[in-house]
């Protein structure tokens, strides 16, 4: 069971999924991707206060040590817990192909 | 293959494994763990400059978008890529037991 989903910093301030629209130029993909020409990137953004969406024991330890030694140990970080696949039409050596990438779009977020 | 392992910020400044010594009291474990009484916590600490130890395509995207929109998109974060198990002697309802935790000590780090 995931640890606390209540954000003590206020609504939307803690680690959660955000969508950021980006062009192929923004991503540096214009030279090899043909479609889609705008990518809706889902990514994990937000703070990870004590025990909020702690991914595992390591995240809990990190929270404790950050409280004790904030200059040495960083707070847990908001990162993808899982991914959604994404299809791209891309250039290849022989022409064009559809390629699915499994590690491109965040599906779910946690703190670690 | 992992992206660049050369740290442009100088030796030891980028995302890598660190060992932090912590007592059971530091970790808030004194009431349920009997041994070890000092834990050498391996954790991932350090900066994630462009493409340094990028875990996957998502990390590469995050780098690109952070460069474009630093106030909206955070830089990739240094987190465990894998873990080492750790055995704790802990109190139980019926006495004492040895318990192995698989997600406690970082083994390897990457940026995501």
């Amino acid at each position: 069971a995931r640890n606390g989903d209540h954000c003590p910093l206020g609504p939307g301030r803690c680690c959660r999924l955000h969508t950021v629209r980006a062009s192929l130029e923004d991503l540096g993909w214009a030279d090899w991707v043909l479609s889609p020409r705008e990518v809706q990137v889902t990514m994990c953004i937000g703070a990870c206060p004590s025990q909020f969406r702690a991914a595992n024991m390591h995240a809990q330890i990190k929270t404790s040590l950050h409280r004790l030694k904030p200059d040495t140990v960083p707070a847990p970080c908001c990162v993808p817990a899982s991914y959604n696949p994404m299809v791209l039409i891309q250039k290849t050596d022989t022409g064009v192909s559809l390629q699915t990438y499994d590690d491109l779009l965040a599906k779910d977020c946690h703190c670690i | 293959a992992r992206n660049g392992d050369h740290c442009p910020l100088g030796p030891g400044r980028c995302c890598r494994l660190h060992t932090v010594r912590a007592s059971l009291e530091d970790l808030g474990w004194a009431d349920w763990v009997l041994s070890p009484r000092e834990v050498q916590v391996t954790m991932c600490i350090g900066a994630c400059p462009s493409q340094f130890r990028a875990a996957n395509m998502h990390a590469q995207i995050k780098t690109s978008l952070h460069r474009l929109k630093p106030d909206t998109v955070p830089a990739p974060c240094c987190v465990p890529a894998s873990y080492n198990p750790m055995v704790l002697i802990q109190k139980t309802d019926t006495g004492v037991s040895l318990q192995t935790y698989d997600d406690l000590l970082a083994k390897d780090c990457h940026c995501i």
């Epitope: 969508t19 214009a30 030279d31 043909l34 479609s35 889609p36 020409r37 705008e38 990518v39 809706q40 889902t42 959604n84 696949p85 994404m86 299809v87 791209l88 039409i89 064009v96 559809l98 699915t100 491109l104 779009l105 599906k107 | -």
Partner: antibody, heavy 119, light 112 residues
Framework: QVQLQESGPGLVKPSQTLSLTCTVS??????????WTWIRQHPGKGLEWIGA???????VYNPSLKSRVTISVDTSKNQFSLKLSSVTAADTAVYYC???????????WGQGTLVTVSS | DIVMTQSPLSLPVTPGEPASISCRSS???????????LDWYLQKPGQSPQLLIY???NRASGVPDRFSGSGSGTDFTLKISRVEAEDVGVYYC?????????FGGGTKVEIK
Amino acid sequence: QVQLQESGPGLVKPSQTLSLTCTVSGGSINSGGYYWTWIRQHPGKGLEWIGAIYYSGSTVYNPSLKSRVTISVDTSKNQFSLKLSSVTAADTAVYYCARGVEYQHFNEWGQGTLVTVSS
Amino acid sequence: DIVMTQSPLSLPVTPGEPASISCRSSQSLLHSNGYNYLDWYLQKPGQSPQLLIYLGSNRASGVPDRFSGSGSGTDFTLKISRVEAEDVGVYYCMQTLEAPPTFGGGTKVEIK
């Protein structure tokens, strides 16, 4: 192999709202890059792109229909839906749902459902 | 909106013989990346349309190599090198350069 299946009433009265649902099986609607699209074909005529939705809920509509169209997605049910308000006889058509990469490469289509607007 | 015009409206063909369909757009479909954003579809009698060609000249998965797409800018051609009985139906070109994507009026291919 992804399959798409349209469902909804085959007869709608003028001025009412046409509602259709497309159920996706054999794959997740949560796949990025794909735009889940509605296209229609008037009897004996050509094809008209109505609009599309991304799994995140972002939509794009044909300007000629925009004031009357709403496309929504329910990722938990692996479905997306079309609502077309204030219909007239001119909206009588076979309605297809399809999967495209952005506005192109519609490589998966539903079998189509005929909707007749009549009193 | 970009207007797509196809010719001929109807094309009687002899099995084993070649066939050619023309498609013209009201503005250039050539993207700055060098690719033409045009698809070709075939709608067989009583069926949904099926993708034949995308990005002007790339055959979709499973499409026989007797189908080929060519052209650039505003003038495009779909060729069938040797027509087979199963190729009958209505062929549509579709511009995919910008929203809304628009279809040509269709070319009906029938056996003589």
